[in-house]
C-alpha cells in the first residue's frame, strides 16, 4: 500500500493509488470496518471524484483506506496508509514529514511545492527555509514554484511551502516540506595538455617569427596553483637568456565544456638555426602533479615549383 501524510488541523487530499488514467468512479472505504466514506461535503472526511478529502485532518484519522475503481469488466482495489501527525513543536522537521529531496546545481533553480496540484489553491504560496520566511529578492515565488537565483551551498536546507485550500467557503492551511541540496559542479583533475600534441614537431622558417601555444585544462573551478609554462632545454624562459624568445603570461580560458584552461604562448621574434636544436617543453601543473609535452622545431621545406 502507498503512504500519505498530513498535519493535524490542516487540509489533506489524497488520490486513489490505483487510479492511473481511469475515468471510472472511485469508492472509498475505511479498510478496517469496510464502511463506505460518503460524498457529502458536509462531512469532515468525504469523497470527491477520485479524491479523499480530510477537511481538516485529525490525528485519529490515521489508518488504512481502501479505494475501489469500478469498471464494467474489472474492479481494482488500492490501499492507502494515511498518517496524520501533530505539528512538530520545534523547527526541526522530522524525516517522516519530508517530501522527496530536490537537487540543484544551476545558477538558477526552482523548488516545486509538493502535492499542491491536488488542492484548490490560490496564489501566493508562502515559502520558508528552516522555518524563516524567505524575503531576499533572490527568492521568487511564482505559481507553485520557488525560484532561487545564484544558488550556493548556503541555500541548502529544508524548504516549506504554505498555501490555502478553499472548499465550501472555508479556507484550510496546507504545509509541505522538502529538502534542497546543491550538487557540486566543480572538480579538479590531473592536468591535460590540449596543445601542442605529444612529441610534436613544428615547421618554422629561418628568420621569420614563430609562436607556439601551450594549452592545458585542470577541471572546473580549479585554478588553485594551476599553471602552464614553457621551458627551453629544461630552463624556464625567463632564465634562458635569449631576448628573442619570450613567453606570454598564461591566460585563463574556458573550453567548450566549461573546463578551466590556461594558455601560454612562446614567441620567437626571428627563428635561427640554433633554435632548431633546442627542446621546447610545454608544462602544465596543478596540485595533482605535472605533465610535459616536448616539441621540436624543424625547418620548413621550400615548396618545389618544378
Amino acid at each position: 500500500s502507498k503512504s500519505s501524510w498530513g498535519l493535524e488541523n490542516e487540509a489533506l487530499i489524497v488520490r486513489c493509488p490505483q487510479r492511473g488514467r481511469s475515468t471510472y468512479p472511485v469508492e472509498w472505504y475505511y479498510s478496517d470496518t469496510n464502511e463506505s466514506i460518503p460524498t457529502q461535503k458536509r462531512n469532515r472526511i468525504f469523497v470527491s471524484r477520485d479524491r479523499l478529502k480530510f477537511l481538516p485532518a485529525r490525528v485519529e484519522d490515521s489508518g488504512i483506506y481502501a479505494c475501489v475503481i469500478r469498471s464494467p469488466n474489472l474492479n481494482k482495489t488500492g490501499y492507502l496508509n494515511v498518517t496524520i501527525h501533530k505539528k512538530p513543536p520545534s523547527c526541526n522537521i522530522p524525516d517522516y514529514l519530508m517530501y522527496s529531496t530536490v537537487r540543484g546545481s544551476d545558477k538558477n533553480f526552482k523548488i516545486t511545492c509538493p502535492t499542491i496540484d491536488l488542492y484548490n489553491w490560490t496564489a501566493p504560496v508562502q515559502w520558508f527555509k528552516n522555518c524563516k520566511a524567505l524575503q531576499e529578492p533572490r527568492f521568487r515565488a511564482h505559481r507553485s514554484y520557488l525560484f532561487i537565483d545564484n544558488v550556493t551551498h548556503d541555500d541548502e536546507g529544508d524548504y516549506t511551502c504554505q498555501f490555502t485550500h478553499a472548499e465550501n467557503g472555508t479556507n484550510y492551511i496546507v504545509t509541505a516540506t522538502r529538502s534542497f541540496t546543491v550538487e557540486e559542479k566543480g572538480f579538479s583533475m590531473f592536468p591535460v595538455i590540449t596543445n601542442p600534441p605529444y612529441n610534436h614537431t613544428m615547421e618554422v622558417e629561418i628568420g621569420k617569427p614563430a609562436s607556439i601555444a601551450c594549452s592545458a585544462c585542470f577541471g572546473k573551478g580549479s585554478h588553485f596553483l594551476a599553471d602552464v609554462l614553457w621551458q627551453i632545454n629544461k630552463t624556464v624562459v625567463g632564465n634562458f637568456g635569449e631576448a628573442r624568445i619570450q613567453e606570454e603570461e598564461g591566460r585563463n580560458e574556458s573550453s567548450s565544456n566549461d573546463m578551466d584552461c590556461l594558455t601560454s604562448v612562446l614567441r620567437i621574434t626571428g627563428v635561427t638555426e640554433k633554435d632548431l636544436s633546442l627542446e621546447y617543453d610545454c608544462l602544465a601543473l596543478n596540485l595533482h602533479g605535472m605533465i610535459r609535452h616536448t616539441i621540436r622545431l624543424r625547418r620548413k621545406q621550400p615548396i618545389d615549383h618544378r
Epitope: 566543480g186 579538479s188 590531473f190 573551478g221 580549479s222 588553485f224 596553483l225 603570461e249 596540485l287 595533482h288
Partner: antibody, heavy 116, light 107 residues
Framework: QVQLVQSGAEVKKPGSSVKVSCKAS????????ISWVRQAPGQGLEWMGW????????NYAQKFQGRVTMTRDTSTSTVYMELSSLRSEDTAVYYC?????????WGQGTLVTVSS | DIQMTQSPSSLSASVGDRVTITCRAS??????LDWYQQKPGKAPKLLIS???NLGSGVPSRFSGSGSGTDFTLTISSLQPEDFATYYC?????????FGGGTKVEIK
C-alpha cells in the same frame, strides 16, 4: 554540504610527533586537494603544504621539508598530516582546507600544544 | 617565495564606514588572489576568490579588485559582524603565501 572534520586537540612533548586527521564528507573526495595551514597563537596564517586526494601527490613548504608527511585514505575520505621532531614553536592551531579556486572549505582546526 | 604585504595591519572603524584593505605582491600574481575573514577562535572563511568572485553566502557589501601586484578588499558599509581579521592569499606560484593580516576593530 561539504564538511571537513578534524581530530581533537593534542598535547605533545618536544621531539615527539603528532598526527592530525581531516575527514571529508559531502563532496567527491578524489576531486580535490587538501591543504594544511597553521596558525601560532596570536600570529598569522602559514602554509604547510598540500596532498592531492586524487593521486596522493604531495608538496611541502620548504620550512617543513623532512618533518612533515601528508597521507590520504580514500576508503574513509580522510587525509592526515604528521609533523615530527616537535618543538615549542610548533604550538599552533592546524587547519585542513579544500583547495579548488581557493581554500573554500576549512576544518574547525586542531590545537597542538608542544610542552615539556 | 612571493611576499604579500598587507596594509594596514590594523584599523579602527565604526558601523557604516567604508573600509579598504590593500595587499601588494612582490611580483605579478595574475588574478590568483583570495581574501579570507577570520574571527577569534574560528577557522578562516573564504570571502573572495580570484580577485573579485564573492564566496558562498558572502554579503554583497564585500568586493575585491586589482590585478598584477596590487589588490584591494572593500567593505562598503561595515556591519557589527564584520569586525574580524582579514588575510589575502596568493596562489599563483608555489608556495602560496598569506599576507600578514588586517585586524578591523570597533572605533
Amino acid at each position: 554540504q561539504v564538511q571537513l572534520v578534524q581530530s581533537g586537540a593534542e598535547v605533545k612533548k618536544p621531539g615527539s610527533s603528532v598526527k592530525v586527521s581531516c575527514k571529508a564528507s559531502g563532496g567527491t573526495f578524489s576531486n580535490y586537494a587538501i591543504s594544511w595551514v597553521r596558525q601560532a597563537p596570536g600570529q598569522g596564517l602559514e602554509w604547510m603544504g598540500w596532498i592531492s586526494a586524487y593521486n596522493g601527490n604531495t608538496n611541502y613548504a620548504q620550512k617543513f621539508q623532512g618533518r612533515v608527511t601528508m597521507t590520504r585514505d580514500t576508503s574513509t575520505s580522510t587525509v592526515y598530516m604528521e609533523l615530527s621532531s616537535l618543538r615549542s614553536e610548533d604550538t599552533a592551531v592546524y587547519y585542513c582546507a579544500r583547495s579548488t579556486n581557493a581554500l573554500d572549505y576549512w576544518g574547525q582546526g586542531t590545537l597542538v600544544t608542544v610542552s615539556s | 617565495d612571493i611576499q604579500m604585504t598587507q596594509s594596514p595591519s590594523s584599523l579602527s572603524a565604526s558601523v557604516g564606514d567604508r573600509v579598504t584593505i590593500t595587499c601588494r605582491a612582490s611580483q605579478g600574481i595574475r588574478s590568483n588572489l583570495d581574501w579570507y575573514q577570520q574571527k577569534p577562535g574560528k577557522a578562516p572563511k573564504l570571502l573572495i576568490s580570484i580577485v573579485s568572485n564573492l564566496g558562498s553566502g558572502v554579503p554583497s557589501r564585500f568586493s575585491g579588485s586589482g590585478s598584477g601586484t596590487d589588490f584591494t578588499l572593500t567593505i562598503s558599509s561595515l556591519q557589527p559582524e564584520d569586525f574580524a581579521t582579514y588575510y589575502c592569499l596568493q596562489h599563483n606560484s608555489n608556495p602560496p603565501t598569506f599576507g600578514g593580516g588586517t585586524k578591523v576593530e570597533i572605533k
